[in-house]
């Protein structure tokens, strides 16, 4: 029973993570613009997503600016969307897994194999979430560098944006609920070992032979 | 008008030192980064050393560490150079320069003032 | 450390002609390349930053371009005020380097 509720709580977390994963790699926030000089009169913000980059004016309006050409973009921003995709096509590959190996269908009958595809699914999971682990830190990296890099100029400054939290959330939640599916089947699966230890019990008496109640004519 | 004027320079021998001044005007110079690079005759230009807005935080290459002391005076507008140990391969045009907001790297350049190292 | 290397290391061409110098970085700097033209007797000054962009007051016959580790700056037209030495410099991380230049003249 406290398997299942495992499952249960790693496949919620896991599907908590996918809708943050989304939300992040979808947002435009993933660097934010950071006014540092104290000369510098702050009139808008600029927002930089993977697929568009906004403007909010101090008035509140936003106009948002889809990429043109894939071609013309930076390498490491191409990258990023391609992790997040697959990121994101890895983890609902996991579901789907996990949904083929629940305690709950009958995709599959054998205990033995619905243990394996959890545990499959959860490996998938955790996969996932390195997955979406890896554009989140590359850009903060970058972030972070470029702040303390002192050739770099102040309006070229960036802050870590919301979408790069909710990266990190959408990668904690996806390794933690990957890593509970993982530990609800030890050994190819959580029932395994107790199934056969009742099989076997029944066949072997209660206490043990000493040596000497054992045939002696098995013996050389 | 943003106006650098380097001075300080001239003729040293081999182990000396020497002190190179840069009188910044025509901009609130505590707000920006400084810069020193040289450059050798008929050589590249190279990158001396860098000093925060602030202060603060300073960044030297490994050719001059030790060696080099940037330092700055935000109420003079002054920015300061030390060079101990000097080398004969030190000798260079020393131009001292201004980040930018806007733009990256070395925006604006001084005139330069000749360092030469000879015995 | 990061080296720089810029070619040609000089040339020699028409007024109106179109003129490419590149550089090439010994590893990835990603686009933290800035380009400086340095005219006779003169300090160096700024042309473009982060590879591509341009500095105010900077003539758009002046454009530069990335393509990974290689960096080219173009002039479009080459005008006579355009004689030089040009030199490329990275500030992806220090040392920050600068290109052995290319000095430009007219034919």
């Known amino acids: 029973m406290a398997s299942a509720g495992m499952q249960i709580l790693g496949v919620v977390l896991t599907l908590l993570g996918w809708v943050n994963g989304l939300v992040s790699c979808a947002l435009p926030m993933w660097k934010v613009t950071a006014f540092i000089g104290n000369s510098i009169v702050v009139a808008q913000v600029v927002w930089e997503g993977l697929w568009m980059s906004c403007v909010v004016q101090s008035t509140g309006q936003m106009q948002c600016k889809v990429y043109d050409s894939l071609l013309a973009l930076p390498q490491d921003l191409q990258a990023a969307r391609a992790l997040c995709v697959i990121a994101l096509l890895v983890a609902l590959f996991g579901l789907l897994v996990y949904l083929a190996g629940a305690k709950c269908t009958t995709c599959v009958e054998e205990k033995d194999s619905k243990a394996r595809l959890v545990l499959t699914s959860g490996i998938v999971f955790v996969i996932s979430g390195v997955l979406t682990l890896i554009p989140v830190c590359w850009t903060a990296h970058a972030i972070i560098r470029d702040f303390y890099n002192p050739l770099v100029a102040e309006a070229q400054k960036r802050e870590l944006g919301a979408s790069l939290y909710l990266g990190w959330a959408a990668s904690g939640l996806l390794l933690l609920g990957g890593g509970l599916l993982c530990c609800t089947c030890p050994s190819g699966g959580s029932q395994g070992p107790s199934h056969y230890m009742a099989r076997y019990s029944t066949s072997a008496p209660a206490i043990s032979r000493g040596p000497s109640e054992y045939p002696t004519k098995n013996y050389v | 008008e943003v106006q650098l004027v380097e001075s300080g320079g001239g003729l040293v021998k081999p182990g000396g030192s020497l002190r190179l001044s840069c009188a910044a005007s025509g901009f609130t110079f505590n707000d920006y980064t400084m810069s020193w690079v040289r450059q050798a005759p008929g050589k590249r230009l190279e990158w001396v050393v860098t000093i925060s807005s602030g202060g603060g935080r300073t960044y030297y290459p490994d050719s001059v560490k030790g060696r080099f002391t940037i330092s700055r005076d935000n109420a003079k507008n002054s920015l300061y150079l030390q060079m101990n140990s000097l080398r004969a391969e030190d000798t260079a045009v020393y131009y001292c320069i201004r980040g930018d907001y806007r733009y990256d790297a070395f925006a604006y350049w001084g005139q330069g003032t000749l360092v030469t190292v000879s015995s | 450390d990061i080296q720089m290397t810029q070619s040609p290391s000089s040339l020699s061409a028409s007024v109106g002609d179109r003129v490419t110098i590149t550089c090439r970085a010994s590893e990835n700097i990603d686009s933290y390349l800035a380009w400086y033209q340095q005219k006779p007797g003169k300090s160096p000054q700024l042309l473009v930053y982060?590879?591509?962009l341009l500095v105010d007051g900077v003539p758009s016959r002046f454009s530069g371009s990335r393509s990974g580790t290689q960096f080219s700056l173009t002039i479009s037209s080459l005008q006579p005020e355009d004689v030089a030495r040009y030199y490329c410099?990275?500030?992806?991380?220090?040392?920050?380097?600068f290109g052995s230049g290319t000095k430009l003249e007219i034919k």
């Open positions: 410099q990275h500030y992806y991380s220090e040392p920050y380097t």
């Open positions: 982060a590879s591509t």
